[in-house]
């Protein structure tokens, strides 16, 4: 089901945002332009009419680390990512729409410029719908292409 998100969502108070790293990419693609906050990402998505890709991850998670490497090294992924507003988060937001089936990491959620969470764009694991592993990189690429087909085109 598609869910419309509020652009005024606040950061989770219990997991407040850490100090900004030297680069907002956090290793997911140093040549790409990354937004700093969820609010900024929603605003840019709406105003630029580009879909938003949100990567939830943790520095000390082996699966986040592994996915990050293949994501950053895959030329097709990196090229396609240029067509998105990009955000990677190492903390949870209070917007429950970004964790439809739990706060596991890594997970990747797409948001349409209409501010609708693309809950229909899922990975291959029934118990963690938005999880991707290094072996799923082709599926992630396909899902990025799906997300680029916007729900409604702005005039």
């Amino acid at each position: 089901k598609d869910i419309t998100v509020k652009s005024g969502a606040k950061k989770d108070t219990k997991d407040s945002a850490p100090k900004l790293p030297q680069t907002l990419s956090r290793g997911w693609g140093d040549q790409l332009i990354w937004t700093q906050t969820y609010e900024e990402a929603l605003y840019k998505s709406k105003t630029s009419n580009k879909p938003l890709m949100i990567i939830h991850h943790l520095d000390e998670c082996p699966h986040s680390q592994a996915l990050k490497k293949v994501f950053a090294e895959n030329k097709e992924i990196q090229k396609l990512a240029e067509q998105f507003v990009l955000l990677n988060l190492v903390y949870e937001t209070t917007d429950k729409h970004l964790s439809p089936d739990g706060q596991y990491v890594p997970r990747i959620i797409f948001v349409d410029p209409s501010l609708t969470v693309r809950a229909d764009i899922t990975g291959r694991y029934s118990n963690r719908l938005y999880a991707y592993e290094p072996s799923d990189i082709a599926l992630l690429l396909d899902n990025m292409k799906k997300a680029l087909k916007l729900l409604k085109t702005e005039l």
Epitope: K69, V70, E133, P134
Partner: antibody, heavy 120, light 107 residues
Framework: QVQLLESGGGLVKPGGSLRLSCATS????????MNWIRQAPGQGLEWIGW????????NYNGKVKDRFTLSADKAKNSVYLQMNSLRAEDTAVYFC?????????????WGQGTLVTVSS | EIVLTQSPDFQSVTPKEKVTITCKAS??????LSWFQQKPDQSPKTLIY???RLVDGVPSRFSGSGSGQDFTLTINSLEAEDAATYYC?????????FGGGTKVEIK
């Protein structure tokens, strides 16, 4: 064919240092995680840490973090385990083990191991 | 750290018999569990990864199942060459941890 070959083991006195090597061949070295695992005589297996040769990112078991350091040399397709301030309890066979071919964390191939004995 | 408890510690089995080894994790590890076989004076060999995926070249008599906290390695019709110690490993969280091992002996 994937091959991992450890070397550098031997007898060392307590407080001493040793550098183990793991020479690899048969796959794209920079794109698979490399783990080090040890096995004390007659005991089970203990994970030491891993390194991503592509950029040198590492993670360690907290038990050895202050004394052991992982590194990689892309030109030589080799990874290294530098062990300092060695103790008797570090006596073990040390294995390198490659992660999944696709960059996944699971351990797919193991070297034959090299024995490190810490004794005075 | 995540603790993996393997059982039994030791199993003496006749050829062609079915062998079942269990591995219980102290917390949910999703399906991030591997199984290894180690023969005396040899390095471990990977049999199963992601709980149930068989590594290329491993005989089909080996199979893995489970998710969450409870996992099983099954050897469907034991052969003499399967005499070894079997270990489970969780790679869901740092530090990766191994079970204590199960020694399988041929009667």
């Amino acid at each position: 064919q994937v091959q991992l070959l450890e070397s550098g083991g031997g007898l060392v006195k307590p407080g001493g240092s040793l550098r183990l090597s793991c020479a690899t061949s048969g796959y794209v070295f920079s794109r698979s995680w490399m783990n080090w695992i040890r096995q004390a005589p007659g005991q089970g297996l203990e994970w030491i840490g891993w390194i991503y040769p592509g950029d040198g990112d590492t993670n360690y078991n907290g038990k050895v973090k202050d004394r052991f350091t992982l590194s990689a040399d892309k030109a030589k397709n080799s990874v290294y385990l530098q062990m300092n301030s060695l103790r008797a309890e570090d006596t073990a066979v040390y294995f390198c083990a490659r992660g999944g071919y696709d960059g996944s964390p699971w351990l797919s191939y193991w070297g034959q191991g090299t024995l490190v004995t810490v004794s005075s | 750290e995540i603790v993996l408890t393997q059982s039994p510690d030791f199993q003496s089995v006749t050829p062609k018999e079915k062998v079942t080894i269990t591995c219980k994790a102290s917390q949910d590890i999703n399906s991030y569990l591997s199984w290894f076989q180690q023969k005396p004076d040899q390095s471990p060999k990977t049999l199963i990864y992601r709980a149930n995926r068989l590594v290329d070249g491993v005989p089909s008599r080996f199979s893995g199942s489970g998710s969450g906290q409870d996992f099983t390695l099954t050897i469907n019709s034991l052969e003499a060459e399967d005499a070894a110690t079997y270990y489970c490993l969780q790679y869901d969280e740092f530090p990766f941890t191994f079970g204590g091992g199960t020694k399988v002996e041929i009667k």
